[in-house]
Interface confidence: medium
Amino acid sequence: MASRSMRLLLLLSCLAKTGVLGDIIMRPSCAPGWFYHKSNCYGYFRKLRNWSDAELECQSYGNGAHLASILSLKEASTIAEYISGYQRSQPIWIGLHDPQKRQQWQWIDGAMYLYRSWSGKSMGGNKHCAEMSSNNNFLTWSSNECNKRQHFLCKYRP
């Protein structure tokens, strides 16, 4: 028994040295169909949902998933590059909303609202939910009416 566990340990250390385990250790696996970027998993869903239904659907996938927060240029551009491989014309709900309807935007997952990437004329009216705008290759956000049905992006930390 001891020799078998020793052999397993040796095998694991060899795999780690050859880099086979390297990616596993550094890069946890995401749910099938989700993509990984810097400690997070993202799921892009081309189903039409209003903002709150999209958030509920993200939560239903478990793992603490929510509509995605986008916290840096690197994260924004990596997501944009990924989505553009599928489509370039439909806006996509993200986890930014204005629940008090006072232009006090916050991320639904509780992340700090520091990075901002609003497109020019994006505020005002009855638009209290944020989408990634297809007008600028998904790199900027616009506000929209929360009952609009559109694609959405979920995110969780594995």
Epitope: G19, G22, D23, M26, K38, S72, L73, K74, S77, T78, A80, E81, S84, G85, N137, L139
Partner: antibody, heavy 119, light 110 residues
Amino acid sequence: QMQLVQSGAEVKKPGSSVKVSCKASGGTFSSSSINWVRQAPGQGLEWMGVIISNLGTPYYAQSFQGRVTISADKSTGTVYLDVSSLRSDDSATYYCARARRLWQTFDIWGKGTLVTVSS
Amino acid sequence: QSVLTQPPSASGAPGQRVVISCSGSTSSIGSNTVNWYKHVPGEAPKLLIYSSTQRPSGVPGRFSGSTSGTSGSLTISGLQSGDEADYYCAAFDDSLNGFVFGTGTKLTVL
């Protein structure tokens, strides 16, 4: 194996601009990004910016913002670096380098284009 | 201005082992992986290590990389005359929103 073929050496006057090209040979830029890196004589490597080939969206290092333009011509598989208002300290070898995806490591490099700025 | 600091020079006799350090910050190496490049003057730089520890195919096992906190290091064992070159670390910097290179280390094989 994809190679990056760069345009030839240039001599420019201060205040003018230069356009350096980088063409994919034996491959395509479609899903990769192309970075520009320069090295002035006796200095280290310096990242200038990147373009996402499939989006055509460029990003620039803060120190080059406004003076540098990176563009791509998908039809010819060529990426361009345009540096305006040249100064003598822009004299350098300019390299293009491919990354398989945006913000990933530069796995294939061009041989470099020497740009000399002199009056 | 580089935000990754390397020793300007390193040296070793053939067969020896040499370690080149790369010191960064929380927003660079502290948050992102490190890449290492070998640059022989007059040639195109060559990728040696990516994702801090991974070797591309064709790079000998004598080259290895590691990181700890806000620093990275490149280890070259069994030093050979062909290893003489400038070595650069690089990483994405979250506060600068772009890549930064190290100051570079000139390796001399004695």
